[in-house]
Interface confidence: low
């Protein structure tokens, strides 16, 4: 038999475990007495379609409930072990009140409020972590989800959603808790060019070689489908047709915050006056998109020794 649980004085709605996709009527019984559970809404415990509703639940409602799906050729019976618990006195939520643990590896993650789809609820859903209301802008409640931006290990813990079920003009509270753990896994993100800065101007000497390195970070772990390349006047270096200007293959490196980055170096063997009028774009691309920083060259001013 399947198990369901709820808290005293809260709404609890359960479905027949045998239901599947059946559209046939469902009858519910107290398993120990075989007494039929009515469909009248005036009762605290009643049947509505395939659902058994406890509005509100009490500790003494705990027990095994039987549901029978009556179809023309076959009757299917399912059993549901319902346990109604007293509200825990402290913030430590016992394991028997926890829904399945969710594991997050994304930089941005969402937690779904368990069982909410069974209820006639209205937004907003309130969320708590370790019993404290979540008020940071990083935490956003939307529909039945809690979105967490920039997830870190500090976000691990027990998350409780609280919402209101409306029935027959009465509102009932429902709470559900699940654990969230952060998996240490790589992530991919929109590229960030760490060097050179946006709209940077670099000083060069005419006739001398010059190198411009462009570094971009793409996340943590794999940077497959990521690349850094240069364009000159919006033209890929290879198509620009200037042998003096070459692009060096990107090399892998890690930044101080453990991000995986790529560097591409644009090498000019001998800077000419013409090069000063060109626009050099460093492009960082991956599947998330593309970003560009434009660099210009400026003649290095001679040092005045007066």
């Amino acid at each position: 038999s399947k198990s369901s649980w709820g808290l005293e004085n809260e709404a609890l709605i359960v479905r027949c475990p045998q239901r599947g996709r059946s559209t046939y009527p469902v009858e519910w019984y107290y398993s120990d007495t075989n007494e039929s559970i009515p469909t009248q809404k005036r009762n605290r415990i009643f049947v509505s379609r395939d659902r058994l509703k406890f509005l509100p639940a009490r500790v003494e409602d705990s027990g095994i409930y039987a549901c029978v799906i009556r179809s023309p050729n076959l009757n299917k019976t399912g059993y549901l072990n319902v346990t109604i618990h007293k509200k825990p006195p402290s913030c430590n939520i016992p394991d028997y009140l926890m829904y399945s643990t969710v594991r997050g590896s994304d930089k941005n993650f969402k937690i779904t409020c368990p069982t909410i789809d069974l209820y006639n609820w209205t937004a907003p859903v309130q969320w708590f972590k370790n019993c404290k209301a979540l008020q940071e802008p990083r935490f956003r409640a939307h529909r039945s989800y809690l979105f967490i931006d920039n997830v870190t290990h500090d976000d691990e813990g027990d998350y409780t959603c609280q919402f209101t079920h409306a029935e027959n003009g009465t509102n009932y509270i429902v709470t559900a808790t699940r654990s969230f753990t952060v998996e240490e896994k790589g992530f991919s993100m929109f590229p960030v060019i760490t060097n050179p800065p946006y709209n940077h101007t670099m000083e060069v000497e005419i006739g001398k070689p010059a190198s411009i390195a462009c570094s971009a970070c793409f996340g943590k772990g794999s940077h497959f489908l990521a690349d850094v390349l240069w364009q000159i006047n919006k033209t890929v270096v290879g198509n620009f047709g200037e042998a003096r200007i070459q692009e060096e293959e990107g090399r892998n490196e890690s930044s101080s915050n453990d991000m995986d980055c790529l560097t591409s170096v644009l090498r000019i063997t001998g800077v000419t006056e013409k090069d000063l009028s060109l626009e050099y774009d460093c492009l960082a691309l991956n599947l998330h998109g593309m970003i560009r920083h434009t660099i210009r060259l400026r003649r290095k001013q001679p040092i005045d020794h007066r």
Partner: antibody, heavy 118, light 107 residues
Framework: EVQLLESGGGLVQPGGSLRLSCAAS????????MSWVRQAPGKGLEWVSA????????YYADSVKGRFTISRDNSKNTLYLQMNSLRAEDTAVYYC???????????WGQGTTVTVSS | DIQMTQSPSSLSASVGDRVTITCRAS??????LNWYQQKPGKAPKLLIY???SLRSGVPSRFSGSGSGTDFTLTISSLQPEDFATYYC?????????FGQGTKVEIK
């Protein structure tokens, strides 16, 4: 003359495979980003895939991801598109194009027709 | 993905007419917009890149303008060989996306 020449198109059954080739001439192929763009009969242009000069960066439209593979052989100046698990909606003229100014497709091949039908 | 919307989807014009086609991006794409011409049974041909830069060899009657989200391709004096379908394409972010095309027909 700068040129791209596609080949490998044809009639294939749904679920089948094809490999398109694009031979490049008269430009620095190994440094050029290359792309495939397709056009279904009577429809507009749809970008399919792209690959960086050294082949390290490859990109795909969501509609072909996991089914198509872009690759290149710089020693042969040739671009490829391996198409697996073909569907009727993949029926189109497939063009290979060089990615040039501003990410524009500045050189195009004449196209090769792929028909997916049973 | 950035959506590109062209208008009109088709237009009828006469030789010598001034023709304007607009392209709107669903978000700002700076000046990273390209225009192509395609004739029936042929491959597209790049006309304008970077919103307003005329590709080498393209007649000067073609011009492009705009920045951000709104762009325009203008043919100052329509010639018989200009009857074709025109596409805009953004290269600001991956994936590159095209407008649905504008067919320029003879009136």
């Amino acid at each position: 003359e700068v040129q791209l020449l596609e080949s490998g198109g044809g009639l294939v059954q749904p679920g089948g495979s094809l490999r398109l080739s694009c031979a490049a001439s008269d430009f620095n192929f190994k440094n050029a980003w290359m792309s495939w763009v397709r056009q279904a009969p009577g429809k507009g242009l749809e970008w399919v895939s792209a690959i960086s000069g050294n082949g390290a960066g490859t990109y795909y439209a969501d509609s072909v991801k996991g089914r198509f593979t872009i690759s290149r052989d710089n020693s042969k100046n040739t671009l490829y598109l391996q198409m697996n698990s073909l569907r009727a909606e993949d029926t189109a003229v497939y063009y290979c194009a060089r990615v040039g100014e501003t990410g524009a497709f500045d050189i195009w091949g004449q196209g090769t027709t792929v028909t997916v039908s049973s | 993905d950035i959506q590109m919307t062209q208008s009109p989807s088709s237009l009828s014009a006469s030789v010598g007419d001034r023709v304007t086609i607009t392209c709107r991006a669903s978000q700002s794409i700076s000046s990273y917009l390209n225009w192509y011409q395609q004739k029936p049974g042929k491959a597209p041909k790049l006309l304008i890149y970077d919103a307003s830069s005329l590709r080498s060899g393209v007649p000067s009657r073609f011009s492009g303008s705009g920045s951000g989200t709104d762009f325009t391709l203008t043919i100052s004096s329509l010639q018989p060989e200009d009857f074709a379908t025109y596409y805009c394409q953004q290269s600001y972010s991956t994936p590159p996306t095209f407008g649905q095309g504008t067919k320029v027909e003879i009136k």
